[in-house]
Each structure stands twice: as C-alpha cells, then as structure tokens.
C-alpha cells in the first residue's frame, strides 16, 4: 500500500532580504486524516511557522487557495524576509489524534538562506 509521502523538492532556497520566499511542499495522499503545519528547525525547540486552523501568521500566505478542494499542495510564501528568517523549514503532516494530533511524517526540509539586500 502506498503510504503518504511529504515532498519538499528544494533542498535550499536563497532570497534577498526584503523579498518573499516560497517554500514548496506537496503530499501524495489525503490520508491519514490530519492537518499539515510548517516549522523552522527540528526537535522540541522548533518554531511553528504556519498552521491554518489556529494562530495568526501575518507574513505567511498559502500558494493554493484555502477553499480548494482535496488540496495536495501545501506550499507557503513568507513575505519581507530578514536575516533572522534563515534556517531549515519543514513541512509536516500530522495524524488526527485525541486529544492531540500526532506527527506522522515530515518533509526532508528546505534550507532558507538570506542574501544581503542589493544596494
């Protein structure tokens, strides 16, 4: 049986300060049931970058429409990039749990590097 795969096609992305960074992620299946989230870094100290269901992420927009049915594209764009945004970003699929969702599978990560703003 084909298990869901989390595909982050770019190992690295380089963006000039002040520009937007697009981080690509796709799933191969709609199951198991559960949400998708983006994080910067790995492990217990990782930073939540985007969760559609709850939270406020003013610099993050989704590449696909949030009302799109049966969406498999979970790419995001982060605006107004600064050097503080550098790091490795992970697209993570969660499996619905009770009471808490459980991490199911992570993408391989995309390293974001920030170039100095051209003068």
């Amino acid at each position: 049986e084909d298990e869901l795969q989390v595909i982050q096609p770019e190992k690295s992305v380089s963006v000039a300060a002040g520009e937007s960074a697009t981080l690509r992620c796709a799933m191969t299946s709609l199951i198991p049931v559960g949400p998708i989230m983006w994080f910067r870094g790995a492990g217990a100290g990782r930073e939540l970058i985007y969760n559609q269901k709850e939270g406020h992420f003013p610099r993050v927009t989704t590449v696909s429409e949030l009302t799109k049915r049966n969406n498999l594209d979970f790419s995001i764009s982060i605006s107004n990039i600064t050097p503080a945004d550098a790091g490795t970003y992970y697209c993570v699929k969660f499996r619905k749990g009770s009471p808490d969702d459980v991490e199911f599978k992570s993408g391989a990560g995309t390293e974001l590097s920030v170039r100095a703003k051209p003068s």
């Epitope: 049986e1 869901l4 299946s29 199951i31 198991p32 049931v33 559960g34 269901k53 949030l66 499996r95």
Partner: antibody, heavy 120, light 108 residues
Framework: DVQLVESGGGVVRPGESLRLSCAAS????????MSWVRQAPGEGLEWVST??????YYADSVKGRFTISRDNSKNTLYLQMNSLRAEDTAVYYC???????????????WGLGTLVTVSS | EIVLTQSPATLSVSPGERVTFSCRAS??????IAWYQQKPGQAPRLLIY???SRDTGIPDRFSGSGSGTDFTLTISSLQSEDFGVYYC??????????FGGGTKVEIK
C-alpha cells in the same frame, strides 16, 4: 462519475452481527478518507465512523461494537457491526470524504444507503 | 461535542419565494460548515462547504454565509425541486462530526 454502492443490510435480532460493504468507483479510492453516516427512520443524520489510511474514528454510540475497514485493492469500504441493538436500526450511507484547505472533512458523495433493521 | 441547532424546524414556502435557513453552533467552528439537501427516499447531496463555497453543479440560487457560530443558507428564489430537508454539518472539531436536526421545506 463517482459511484458508491452499499450492500449487506437486512433484518437481524438484537445481539447479532452484520457486515456492510460499499463498492466505490470513479475516483482514486486509496487516497481519500471514507465514512459511514446513518439515519434512523424519520430522524436526522448521525455520523458513525471514518477511516483514513489505517486511522479510524468512531461515534461513542458504536465504539467497541463497530469496526470500519477498507480494501484498497478492491475499492471497497466495510462496516462490521457486532452486538447490534434496536437503536442501531437505520439506513446506513457510505460517504466519500472531501477535504478543504489544510484540514477539515465533509462528505461530497453519498451512496443510496442500505437499511439495517434490528428487531426481536 | 459541538451541537448544531437549526431553525426553524419546518418552513412552508411558495415557489419563487426567498428562503433563509439558520444553523447555530454551540461554539466557534470558524467557517467549517457544510450544507446538504435531502429529498424523500434519497441520499443527502452536498450544496455548500466552507460556509459559502458552492459545490460543483449547484445552482447559484443557493448561497451560504456566516462564520464563528452563526450560519445561513439562502435560496434566492425557491424552485419546485428544492423541497426537502436541509442539514448543516460542522467539521471544525471532530470526532464526532455533528449535524443539525434539519429544516424541512414544505409547499405552502
């Protein structure tokens, strides 16, 4: 065209078992969650169970008695119903789940249903 | 468990009239509401999802609105084929998925 065809309903006595099947066609069955929703005679809709890959979810009223499963090689969804009670009497609908956004499921296609009657 | 309350329970309407159905959630469900139509002896049919998005092939006389706890389904001009029972469903917090009790639309 998406098609969902339920079978296996019938009349049973309280405490007996029944297995419902739902044959699916017209879509990539293996990548979608699937559900069972029931409707007692003259009543509203009640969600029964959902299956993703091997992740399963049940209404409290059927937990421990009903088991949902799927066979992706046969494009078929199942509901094994044990220890049936009079209050399980209903039309059982098979439904295809649809997601919107990054999470959240509703039911975009339904079968015609199969009637289960539990009576002594 | 999130409880959905639909009102009124029954509506008597003439063809051509504008019809409004209400669905109220016991807690915030964001925009995670779907609406279904069910005719006697038939399976439910999806009309609206994400509170306001029409399903494929649904006529534009059907529209949905609302967010949070209060939702509305409107039929701008009721046609004879629109009679039946209408249900709302929440998918914000589950299990369980929950449905409203339904609103029955009868011919006046």
């Amino acid at each position: 065209d998406v098609q969902l065809v339920e079978s296996g309903g019938g009349v049973v006595r309280p405490g007996e078992s029944l297995r419902l099947s739902c044959a699916a066609s017209g879509f990539s069955f293996s990548i979608y969650a699937m559900s069972w929703v029931r409707q007692a005679p003259g009543e509203g809709l009640e969600w029964v169970s959902t299956i993703g890959a091997d992740d399963t979810y049940y209404a409290d009223s059927v937990k421990g008695r009903f088991t949902i499963s799927r066979d992706n090689s046969k494009n078929t969804l199942y509901l094994q119903m044990n220890s049936l009670r009079a209050e399980d009497t209903a039309v059982y609908y098979c439904a295809k789940d649809s997601t919107v956004g990054w999470s959240g499921d509703f039911f975009d296609y339904w079968g015609l249903g199969t009637l289960v009657t539990v009576s002594s | 468990e999130i409880v959905l309350t639909q009102s009124p329970a029954t509506l008597s309407v003439s063809p051509g009239e504008r019809v409004t159905f209400s669905c109220r959630a016991s807690q915030n469900v964001r925009s995670d509401i779907a609406w279904y139509q069910q005719k006697p002896g038939q399976a439910p049919r999806l009309l609206i999802y994400a509170a306001s998005s029409r399903d494929t092939g649904i006529p534009d006389r059907f529209s949905g609105s609302g967010s949070g706890t209060d939702f509305t389904l409107t039929i701008s001009s009721l046609q004879s084929e629109d009679f039946g029972v209408y249900y709302c469903q929440q998918y914000y917090d589950w299990p369980p998925f929950t449905f409203g009790g339904g609103t029955k639309v009868e011919i006046k």
